[in-house]
């Protein structure tokens, strides 16, 4: 018998009624009589509606489902789901019995818009050019997690510091929480992009900062506008420069390197000499190029902690700074893959790809492959770990049913050293056994 | 040498349906995918789908979806694109192209000469 | 879906200039391909995996990268550079082009 269900999951919103289709083709002379419909959970098996011995046997589900009696007789064994629920996303299965008997699974996929993003600000007052703010943009009750995008007000993105957070309510909705932390410019534009995937729907927010122009130094400071890229254990240096007057001496220079966030002293050269290194130990000036105006910072054996911005503060008579950005990055290792189970392998197994890779910074994007090219995106999961140095180890696992032979290929990519290392693994023939026996 | 020649120029009325052939020469044809690219008058390259000759697995674009078909026929190393339903918007240059290289280096490497399809009533 | 936009859509340039033609995609991609299409002619590989040159192809093509921009770089323009170069990914389905950038000679 054959059953019929759409082959695309049914997308309904959370609170609506949804209709899960599912048709058979009954032949001359068919009676209700002769029908057994049940719809259960795919995966639990769980008995969700039923129509047997001729009758509606009712919802064993919640009582928020029903059949479509009055088209049953004409092969519509559809059932409706009242009041979506997120936890009624999931596979379920139409099982149609006459004298033989047929099945299929239609997926229902869940989604609720996102509410349009409130935006906060903080500090909020007193703003001057050079600050750094943190801006927090919120949008609620929506489902399935959503993806954040941040844009500046001539739409580039803003990618740099973000942090998101989406936390699901008892009903499962979530809401999300997107924090951006950023340098004022003179003024500027920040909106925040809130997409459901599901829905394609976009929800945005957007805040215009305008700050008070600071008191300008007449000493002006230069830093370099890219984040400086240093590699985990290495040496960094950020550059920082002014331009002394004739007839300037060190004896009126103060130099003060801080941390821009917390002002944590890093290094200073005050009252004609070098004070030292207030940060651990790793920290030189040029000394012998300061009389120059190079005020450039030595940062010794990098670690992942030391990534963000550097304040480089001159005093002469007048006072400038200016802040750099170091950007920390670590290179991640060539892919070990692994293949479970991995012995005696058929055409049709469902199998389990394990690509990891170790050590790098920052997190990594991995892609998977085919043999011919194409991107494998069905069943992936990625998860890194960052250990004690802060530095992240990736696991990425593809489940994938085997073809005759295929080459499944993982990418492991460094977004900040655009450096990528890749693994694959090529199942060949069957049966067979990974790795290969000698 | 690697090459991949397509049908000629077809005209077509609404409602109708057009096939479109590509045959390869030079190279394994069950090795690497043939994807279908099109280019209306004067705008850009539209991917239509591909079809893998050796397990005949075919992907399309949403767009196409239902209304595009992909097949191969190993035994003359021929692809082949029918689209129906043929409306004007679908007046165009049809393209097949090789998708070759080695993981994870992939591009269209070889082109057809293209196929005009002209749909007018 | 990943949309790539190229910018820009045109540029009339002299030879022995530097040219840029960027191209952005909405999320981030494995690799980005390039191609070179000529008035009546078929598209020709150009660029492929984001900087390699496609056999042929001259040494003042280049190809930078930073976040999602792909920037494809001509260092002294030449007059048989004349064409629209479209970018191209496929890290997830659907596979997608930008929507060209034509480039024309003084």
């Known amino acids: 018998l054959e059953v019929q269900v759409p082959e695309d999951p049914v997308v309904a919103l959370v609170g609506t009624d949804a209709t899960l289709r599912c048709s058979f083709s009954p032949e001359p002379g068919f009676s209700l009589a002769q029908l057994n419909l049940i719809w259960q959970l795919t995966d639990t098996k769980q008995l969700v509606h039923s129509f047997t011995e001729g009758r509606d046997q009712g919802s064993a589900y919640a009582n928020r489902t029903a059949l479509f009696l009055d088209l049953l007789a004409q092969g519509n064994a559809s059932l409706r789901l009242q009041r979506v629920r997120v936890a009624d996303e999931g596979s379920f299965t139409c099982f149609v019995s006459i004298r033989d008997f047929g099945s299929a699974a239609v997926s229902l996929q869940v989604a609720a818009p996102y509410s349009k993003p409130s935006m906060t600000l903080e500090p909020n007052k007193d703003l001057r050019p050079g600050d750094t703010v943190t801006i927090t943009c919120s949008s609620y009750r929506g489902y399935p997690e959503a993806e954040v995008f941040w844009q500046d007000g001539q739409g580039a993105p803003l990618t740099g510091n973000v942090t998101t957070s989406q936390m699901a309510n008892e009903q499962g909705l979530f809401d999300v929480h997107s924090v951006l932390r950023v340098v004022l410019g003179a003024n500027g534009t920040y909106s925040c992009l809130v997409r459901n995937p599901v829905l394609q729907q976009d929800a945005h927010g957007s805040i215009t900062i305008t700050p008070q122009r600071s008191p300008t130094g007449a000493v002006e400071v230069q830093v370099p506008e890219d984040p400086v890229v240093a590699l985990v254990g290495t040496d960094a240096t950020l550059r920082c420069s002014f331009s002394p007057e004739p007839g300037f001496s060190l004896a009126q220079l103060n130099l003060i390197w801080q941390l821009t966030d917390t002002k944590q002293l890093v290094h200073s050269f005050t009252e004609g000499r070098d004070q030292g290194s207030a940060y651990a130990n790793r920290t030189a000036l040029f000394l012998d190029l300061l009389a120059q105006g190079n005020a450039s910072l030595r940062l010794q054996r990098v670690r992942v902690a030391d990534e963000g911005s550097f304040t480089c503060f001159v005093s002469i008579r007048d006072f400038g700074s200016a802040a750099v950005s170091l950007q920390v990055a670590a290179p991640y290792s060539k892919p070990s893959m692994t293949l479970e189970p991995n012995k005696d392998l058929r055409p049709g197994d469902t199998v389990t790809i394990t690509c990891s890779s170790y050590r790098g910074y920052p997190e990594a994007e991995v892609f998977w492959q085919d043999g011919q090219g194409a991107p494998l995106t069905g069943n992936v999961t990625t998860s890194q770990m960052a250990n004690e140095q802060g530095l992240f180890d990736v696991h990425s696992v593809l489940r994938v049913v085997l073809g005759a032979n295929g080459t499944y290929s993982c990418l492991v990519r460094n977004p900040v050293l655009q450096q990528d290392a890749h693994g694959s693994v090529t199942i060949t023939g069957q049966p067979m056994t990974f790795p290969p026996e000698a | 040498e690697v090459q991949l020649v397509q049908s000629g120029a077809e005209v077509k009325k609404p409602g109708s349906s057009v096939k479109v052939s590509c045959k390869a020469s030079?190279?394994?044809?069950?090795?690497?995918?043939i994807h279908w690219v099109r280019q209306a008058p004067g705008q850009g390259l539209e991917w239509m789908g591909y079809?893998?000759?050796?397990?005949?697995?075919?992907d399309y674009a949403q767009k196409f979806q239902g209304r595009v078909t992909l097949t191969a026929d190993k035994s003359t190393s021929t692809a082949y694109m029918e689209l129906s339903s043929l409306r004007s918007e679908d007046t165009a240059v049809y393209y097949c192209a090789r998708y070759s290289g080695s993981t994870p280096y992939w591009y269209f490497d070889v082109w057809g000469q293209g196929t005009t399809v002209t749909v007018s009533s | 879906e990943i949309v790539l936009t190229q910018s820009p859509d045109f540029q009339s340039v002299t030879p022995k200039e530097k040219v840029t033609i960027t191209c952005r995609a909405s999320?981030?991609?494995?690799?980005m391909n390039w191609y070179q299409q000529k008035p009546d002619q078929s598209p020709k590989p150009w660029i492929y995996?984001?900087?390699n040159l496609a056999s042929g192809v001259p040494s003042r093509f280049s190809v930078s990268v930073s976040g999602t921009d792909h920037t494809l770089t001509i260092n002294s323009l030449e007059a048989e550079d004349a064409a629209t170069y479209y970018c191209?990914?496929?890290?997830?389905?659907?596979?997608?082009f930008g929507q060209g950038t034509k480039l024309e000679i003084k």
């Open positions: 995996a984001t900087s």
């Open positions: 999320s981030s991609v494995s690799y």
């Open positions: 030079g190279y394994s044809f069950t090795s690497y995918t």
């Open positions: 079809i893998n000759p050796n397990s005949r697995n075919t």
């Open positions: 191209q990914q496929w890290s997830s389905n659907p596979l997608t």
